[in-house]
């Protein structure tokens, strides 16, 4: 079959890292400078990536792969292949249009990233709290009061009705 | 022959967003780049980025990241060029044109649409 | 990012006259990667030279390329009317590509 394609299409030759030149007679023309091909039978390579600002290098393109980039610190990558890089936040707290803003009573962040998500309610699995929730940690739920020793007692705050994703401001 | 045609004339408010499209004649539209390049009026050219048909693979100049998103569909060769939270400064004419890196040029380019941004 | 200089923006010749513009980069371009567009008022930009020295097809013979690192230039050895126009280099040394600001041959 690969000697079939090579008949029909010359350009089935090229190796990645090279690109099929229609300008010289479909000749496999090595990638220019900055540039890649990941696949053989290109007809064109690609500019490579480049991690400025925000991004930094995480592997060098070569003429057969593209750069990698991921975030300096203080930043973490979103989107494929690290499309974006959003500030990190303190445990505790989450990132809203106005900066990180730490999370409301009833929710918890114990990640750098990410939104303040409600804190377990013990109750709804017929548990206690056995260790209060906190800003950067979800309760810890322990035995059902049926099982507590007499004259102990625990209470479990309601979790606050807030949407997924929206951020108090 | 090898032709690109671009859409016509826009004339939008500031903040809005704006899709411009160049569809693709007389070529196999995945082998070659489709640049997008911008000229203020009696100005020079500055080059927006491309994309690749073939991998759907794009590339901002820095100066255009966030500003420009390209995309293409490969069923009609038509390549888009969306300008987002447009301002004053966004009013130009903006071409497409055909590219392939290895040599580096732009071989043919469209008419040009002319983007107005003013209230 | 490779900035490119046409230091001339306007240049006045007459019918007949040789004619020399020049582009400068702020640092070295292969030549390989080196070009040159011709747009006429109201057009759009037409690849006229690449890799410094390739006429683009339908350039007459009069227009000539030269150059390396990071001086190059546009020659046309005898100028005619339908040479008004604005001239622009570019540039490939990974992105972005970049342009000259043009330099407009008027015809006096």
């Known amino acids: 079959f690969e000697r079939t394609r090579s008949l029909q299409d010359p350009c089935s030759n090229c190796p990645a890292g090279t690109f099929c030149d229609n300008n010289r007679n479909q000749i496999c023309s090595p990638c220019p400078p900055n540039s890649f091909s990941s696949a053989g039978g290109q007809r064109t390579c690609d500019i490579c990536r480049q991690c400025k600002g925000v991004f930094r290098t995480r592997k060098e393109c070569s003429s057969t792969s593209n750069a990698e980039c991921d975030c300096t610190p203080g930043f973490h990558c979103l989107g494929a292949g690290c499309s974006m890089c959003e500030q990190d936040c303190k445990q505790g707290q989450e990132l809203t249009k106005k900066g990180c803003k730490d999370c409301c009573f009833g929710t918890f962040n114990d990640q750098k990233r990410g939104i303040c998500r409600p804190w377990t309610n013990c109750s709804l699995d017929g548990k206690s709290v056995l260790v209060n929730g906190t800003k950067e940690r979800d309760v810890v739920c322990g035995p059902s009061p049926a099982d507590l020793s007499p004259g102990a007692s625990s209470v479990t705050p309601p979790a606050p009705a807030r949407e997924p994703g929206h951020s108090p401001q | 022959q090898v032709q690109l045609q671009q859409s016509g004339a826009e004339l939008v408010r500031p903040g809005a967003s704006v899709k411009i499209s160049c569809k693709a004649f007389g070529f196999t539209f995945t082998h070659h780049h489709i640049n997008w390049v911008k000229q203020r009026p009696g100005q020079g050219l500055d080059w927006i980025g491309y994309?690749?048909?073939?991998?759907?693979?794009?590339i901002y100049n820095q100066k255009f990241e966030g500003k420009a998103t390209l995309t293409v569909d490969k069923s009609s060769s038509t390549a888009y060029m969306e300008l987002s939270r447009l301002t004053s400064d966004d009013s130009a004419v903006y071409f497409c044109?055909?590219?392939?890196?290895?040599?580096?040029?732009?071989?043919?380019w469209g008419q040009g649409t002319t983007l107005t941004v003013s209230s | 990012d490779i900035v490119m200089t046409q230091s001339t923006a306007i240049m006045s010749a007459s019918l007949g006259e040789k004619v020399t513009m020049t582009c400068r980069a702020s640092?070295?371009?292969?030549?390989?990667?080196l070009h040159w567009y011709q747009q006429k008022s109201g057009a759009s930009p037409k690849i006229w030279i690449s890799?410094?020295?390739n006429l683009a097809s339908g350039v007459p013979v009069r227009f000539s390329g030269s150059g390396s690192g990071t001086s190059y230039s546009l020659t046309i050895s005898s100028v005619e009317a339908e040479d008004a126009a604005t001239y622009y280099c570019q540039q490939y040394s990974g992105n972005p590509y970049t342009f000259g600001g043009g330099t407009k041959l008027e015809i006096k």
């Open positions: 994309i690749n048909p073939y991998n759907d693979y794009s």
């Open positions: 044109a055909r590219g392939g890196l290895g040599r580096g040029y732009f071989d043919y």
């Open positions: 640092s070295s371009v292969t030549s390989s990667y």
């Open positions: 890799s410094t020295s």
